[in-house]
């Protein structure tokens, strides 16, 4: 469900929301760290709709979400598991 | 205008089955999903069931999926409850809602219900 | 099944006064709260969602607030409109479970 991608393409997010989504209408979740032309870092939320929504990294549900799924992770794998994007 | 009308409500034996429909209009039906929420007399709320807008997902309440099937017509732009071996306890109004799954992601439009009266 | 236990269950308040329903949820649901108002023999209608966010055309003196297992619902300025039943509800997952109600009544 998380995905870490480090791009050099400038920032993909103009809009942010802070609004919490159920975790059954997620498809996945892409982080994009800071750095590489864009100066903040920047989270992805792929909808089961097909639609995109950009969350604000700052945002409570988003933070306690990835808190769950990081103890979740850990628990299973070794370590983390990070996808990397060619750009 | 968002429009749910609920119909297929009525007196009933138990034991009996019921066919509920909700017709929605000014809204693109095919990309929401759609719940069924249900109130006994005097009580809460109480959520039956949803359906995703391919019918692909589907969840109940774990003590009504036995005897409750929620389906769908996109084509139609209606929503159906079938609910079978009714009981006195299923006695309530049920309301059809939509499930913003965009921008709100619970229920944000509701109908204004149909009664369902179970008894001998 | 996720518990919602709302209280009070009735509440009688005078007009201006500021208006306090609380929701203890039986486990964490993130913000994944929502506050309905209903009239009777009418439908609910959504006031708030994801625990503190007003829906379109609520006015302001209804807000939200909390996270995880506590949630609070306000009204700061009671008006004679307001008298109705609130319900709340959480949407992290299915089962989707409401709260018990509370009644508001004027003095």
């Known amino acids: 469900v998380l995905e870490v991608y480090y791009t050099s393409l400038r920032c993909r997010c103009v809009q942010e929301s802070s609004v919490f989504i159920p975790r059954r209408f997620i498809d996945r979740i892409q982080i994009l760290p800071r750095g590489n032309g864009c100066p903040r870092k920047e989270i992805i939320v792929w909808k089961k709709n097909k639609s995109i929504v950009c969350v604000d990294p700052q945002a409570e549900w988003i933070q306690r979400m990835m808190e769950v799924l990081r103890k979740r992770s850990s628990s299973t794998l070794p370590v983390p598991v990070f996808k990397r994007k060619i750009p | 205008e968002v429009q749910l009308v609920e119909s297929g409500g009525g007196l009933v034996q138990p034991g009996g089955s019921l066919r509920l429909s909700c017709a929605a209009s000014?809204?693109?039906?095919?990309?929401?999903?759609m719940s069924w929420v249900r109130q006994a007399p005097g009580k809460g709320l109480e959520w039956v069931a949803e359906?995703?807008?391919?019918?692909?997902?589907?969840n109940y309440a774990p003590s009504l999926k036995d005897r409750f099937t929620i389906s769908r017509d996109n084509a139609k732009n209606s929503l159906y409850l079938q609910m079978n071996s009714l009981r006195a306890e299923d006695t309530a109004v049920y309301y059809c809602a939509r499930q913003d799954d965009y921008e709100h992601y619970t229920m944000d439009y509701w109908g204004q219900g149909t009664t369902v009266t179970v008894s001998s | 099944d996720i518990q919602m236990t709302q209280s009070p269950s009735s509440l009688s308040a005078s007009v201006g006064d500021r208006v306090t329903i609380t929701c203890k949820v039986s486990?964490?649901?993130?913000?994944?709260v929502a506050w309905y108002q209903q009239k009777p023999g009418k439908a609910p209608k959504l006031l708030i969602y994801?625990?503190?966010y007003r829906y379109t055309g609520v006015p302001s003196r209804f807000s939200g607030s909390g996270s995880g297992t506590d949630f609070t619902f306000t009204i700061s300025s009671l008006q004679p409109e307001d008298i109705a039943t609130y319900y709340c509800q959480q949407y992290y997952s299915t089962p989707l479970t409401f709260g018990g109600g509370t009644k508001l009544e004027i003095k």
């Open positions: 994801s625990a503190s």
């Open positions: 359906i995703n807008p391919e019918s692909s997902t589907i």
């Open positions: 486990q964490d649901v993130n913000t994944g």
């Open positions: 000014g809204i693109d039906f095919s990309r929401y999903w």
